[in-house]
């Protein structure tokens, strides 16, 4: 459900969904629009000043690295 | 269907470690939360953790804090609770427990059959 | 940390009688409460969610109720597998936790 996530309670949603992924709090460079001009959003203003979808929080997730071979 | 199957039964020693098994199936393992909760002989029921099994993240019940360690294995769909330095007091019934947390429903809605340890000299 | 206080500690009713079951937390909790029901030897198993949601597969005569402190699931018109212990649960959302109250045993006289 929606949920307003503010300061050190969005930071330990964060990561604990994210986990040992870490996370952003700017989407990275090239998630979404492709437009230069677009003002990049962030998870405060996603989830502090409006509310969330709990699943946004999952968007700001560093991306899974890949396993590491021998 | 959904399920959650845990070990039977476990006797250790005082001083000892557990590491008790919870294999989920029926269900994608990564997009549900898993608690783990305890019930000793006659008593009610005691939340120890809880563990995201996409990202591995933990969260610990403070009394349990040092003591218990909560994994998972995506591989095989377990998650497992490690409870070291066991005592007399943590012969109980440890239970797995699935959350819906992203429904943002409160409850944990499928249980495991539990695994009885018993710690005993 | 919130705790959970559930009275009375035990219920005897006739079948057919109602069972009005209490809990209260320590702090302004909202909804985020459960109910769970638990027979000897077996698991619990969620009747609400929500404090007011019945779980899928609950029949019609449990119902929750409350939010904030105080909460309460009533059993309209017992029938003799009602009688178990009833737990209820809060719910913290970040990081995430759970407590327990410490149970109700309705007996069926």
């Known amino acids: 459900g929606p949920e307003t996530l503010c300061g050190a309670e969005l930071v330990d949603a964060l990561q604990f969904v994210c986990g040992d992924r870490g996370f952003y709090f700017n989407k990275p460079t090239g998630y979404g629009s492709s437009s230069r001009r677009a003002p990049q959003t962030g998870i405060v203003d996603e989830c502090c000043f409006r509310s969330c979808d709990l699943r946004r929080l999952e968007m700001y997730c560093a991306p899974l690295k890949p396993a590491k071979s021998a | 269907q959904v399920q959650l199957v845990q070990s039977g039964v476990e006797v250790k020693k005082p001083g000892a470690s557990v590491k008790v098994p919870c294999k989920a199936s029926g269900y994608t393992f990564t997009s549900y939360y898993m608690h783990w909760v305890r019930q000793a002989p006659g008593q009610g029921l005691e939340w120890m953790g809880i563990?995201?099994?996409?990202?591995?993240?933990?969260s610990y019940a403070q009394k349990f804090q040092g003591r218990v360690t909560m994994t998972r294995d995506t591989s095989t769909s377990t998650v497992y609770m490690e409870l070291s330095s066991l005592r007399s007091e943590d012969t109980a019934v440890y239970y797995c427990a699935r959350d819906d947390f992203w429904s943002g429903a409160v409850g944990m809605d499928v249980w495991g059959q539990g695994t009885t340890v018993t710690v005993s000299s | 940390d919130i705790q959970m206080t559930q009275s009375p500690a035990t219920l005897s009713l006739s079948p057919g009688e109602r069972a009005t079951l209490s809990c209260r937390a320590s702090q302004d909790v909202g909804s985020d409460l459960a109910w769970y029901q638990q027979k000897p030897g077996q698991p619990p198993r969620l009747l609400v969610s929500?404090?007011?949601n019945r779980a899928t597969g609950i029949p019609a005569r449990f119902s929750g109720s409350g939010s904030g402190t105080d909460f309460k699931l009533t059993i309209n018109s017992l029938e003799p597998e009602d009688s178990a212990v009833y737990y209820c649960?809060?719910?913290?959302?970040?990081?995430?936790?759970?407590?327990f109250g410490g149970g109700t045993k309705v007996e069926i006289k």
């Open positions: 563990i995201n099994p996409s990202g591995g993240s933990t």
């Open positions: 929500d404090a007011s």
């Open positions: 649960q809060q719910r913290r959302r970040w990081p995430p936790g759970a407590t």
